[in-house]
């Protein structure tokens, strides 16, 4: 039951995280105009990964896409790539994890196969979360660098003619959404990996075999002391005889080519 809960929670947390990563990637507020020097501006600038916008106090907002690839800073391209990779990995991870969920039955899929899929999706979520966190952090670092550069040189000449105050940009809402979303995806991935350990059969239990020694009639069970006392790794004390109705957690696993433990 705990395994199912951990896996389900990991899936939900990752789903929220990936939705957040997608939202952050699409948002226009990656960087917003710093209003420290001019808190009463009638024109507010903000920028995203795909376009830059200007909101006038009249209510009119104008956005312009970055209709160039070669003219964009390499760092921005890198951030775009990281976010897209994060989304793609996360989406694949979600797809895999849906089939891996213990509460969903697909044919006669074995626990070991589900464990493999859970681990795969968990790793994908972790990498996806790391990509998002890395992307957002790279952008934030770029902002901090530019912020202090423009602070050091607040007044810059435009073509040597007009003196204009340089617009400084600070962290936008998308950065915080990205960090939180990346963190959630990462946590969801870790939870999936933890759930995978619980799904995987930790020990192979065989059907009871009777050995007939001369003069004695004693039945020996493989596993010796562990199997009969409930100590060791087999804490669930699974039934090792064949027959009777079983609960989901009691279903016996048999060795297969998918086993990796």
């Amino acid at each position: 039951m705990a395994v199912t809960a951990c896996q389900g929670l990991g899936f939900v947390v990752s789903l929220i995280g990936i939705a957040g990563i997608i939202a952050a990637t699409c948002m226009d507020q990656w960087s917003t105009q710093d209003l420290y020097n001019n808190p009463v501006t009638a024109v507010f600038n903000y920028q995203g990964l795909w376009r830059s916008c200007v909101r006038e106090s009249s209510g009119f907002t104008e956005c312009r896409g970055y209709f160039t690839l070669l003219g964009l800073p390499a760092m921005l391209q890198a951030v775009r790539a990281l976010m897209i990779v994060g989304i793609v990995l996360g989406a694949i991870g979600l797809l895999v994890s849906i089939f891996a969920l213990k509460c969903i039955r697909i044919g006669s899929m074995e626990d070991s196969a589900k464990a493999n899929m859970t681990l795969t999706s968990g790793i994908m979520f972790i990498v996806s979360g790391l990509c998002a966190i890395a992307g957002v952090s790279v952008f934030a670092n770029m902002l901090v660098t530019n912020f202090w550069m423009s602070t050091a040189n607040m007044y810059t000449g435009m073509g040597g003619m007009v003196q204009t105050v340089q617009t400084r940009y600070t962290f936008g809402a998308a950065l915080f959404v990205g960090w939180v979303a990346g963190g959630l995806t990462l946590i969801g991935g870790v939870m999936m990996c933890i759930a995978c350990r619980g799904l995987a059969p930790e020990e192979t239990n065989y059907k009871a075999v009777s050995y007939h020694a001369s003069g004695h009639s004693v039945a020996y069970k493989p596993g010796g002391f562990k199997a009969s006392t409930g100590f060791g790794s087999n804490t669930k004390n699974k039934k090792i005889y064949d027959g009777g109705a079983r609960t989901e957690d009691e279903v016996q696993s048999y060795p297969s080519k998918h086993d990796y433990v």
Epitope: V40, V162, T164
Partner: antibody, heavy 119, light 113 residues
Framework: DVQLVESGGGLVQPGGSLRLSCAAS????????MHWVRQAPGKGLEWVAY????????YYADTVKGRFTLSRDNPKNTLYLQMNSLRAEDTAVYYC????????????WGQGTTVTVSS | DVVLTQSPDSLAVSLGERATISCKSS????????????LTWYQQKPGQTPTLLIY???TRKSGVPDRFTGSGSGTDFTLTISSLQAEDVAVYYC?????????FGAGTKVEIK
């Protein structure tokens, strides 16, 4: 058609109060920022105050700050300017205008209401 | 606060001649984000309310005759009436719409010589 109609002007003694109203029609009032601009007799235009569409941002000219209060009632499509501690130099025609256009430009103006501060 | 200095105070021009009004700002009105200058020009005819002529320093409002031209960037702006008509007799104001308070210039009175 966009219409802005000011009312509430009149003669008031120095130190007195007056409340101007601006009734808007012909556009989605709740979506646009609104301004008050005044013009003293024979003088130029002087911007007085601005209120954003949702009243989140309100700005005043230094000459009226602390004395004038700007508000709006979006369901009633009405803009208000509460003027307290009036001085002789506040005598002017008061126009309400809207930044309905691009570039923060004041596109639509009312006909104005006259405020006279005199003893 | 942004201070706008208009010159000349008044201008007398013959019909069909060019009228040029200058507006200088104490601060740049250029916005890097959209590469636009936040300066507006208004016309106020005698006994009438002001009307918008030009926004973004050089964009004519629809319906405004093309003899009115706005130019300039940063701190120096100009309104040009290429061929003055009788109906152009008015006071012209420039306005900073970049930062609050949205200050106006003192105005330039255009008359016929």
């Amino acid at each position: 058609d966009v219409q802005l109609v000011e009312s509430g002007g009149g003669l008031v003694q120095p130190g007195g109060s007056l409340r101007l109203s601006c009734a808007a029609s012909g556009f989605t009032f709740s979506s646009f920022g609104m301004h008050w601009v005044r013009q003293a007799p024979g003088k130029g235009l002087e911007w007085v105050a601005y209120i954003s569409s949702g009243s989140g941002s309100i700005y005043y000219a230094d000459t009226v700050k602390g004395r004038f209060t700007l508000s709006r009632d979006n369901p009633k499509n009405t803009l208000y300017l509460q003027m307290n501690s009036l001085r002789a130099e506040d005598t002017a025609v008061y126009y309400c205008a809207t930044s309905y256009y691009y570039g923060n430009a004041l596109e639509y103006w009312g006909q104005g209401t006259t405020v006279t501060v005199s003893s | 606060d942004v201070v706008l200095t208009q010159s000349p105070d008044s201008l007398a021009v013959s019909l069909g001649e060019r009228a040029t009004i200058s507006c200088k700002s104490s601060q740049s009105l250029f916005n890097v984000g959209n590469q636009k200058n936040y300066l507006t020009w208004y016309q106020q005819k005698p006994g009438q309310t002001p009307t918008l002529l030009i926004y973004w320093a050089s964009t004519r409002k629809s319906g405004v005759p093309d003899r009115f031209t706005g130019s300039g960037s940063g701190t120096d702006f100009t309104l040009t009436i290429s061929s003055l008509q009788a109906e152009d007799v008015a006071v012209y104001y420039c306005q900073n719409v970049y930062s609050y308070p949205l200050t106006f210039g003192a105005g330039t009175k255009v008359e016929i010589k």
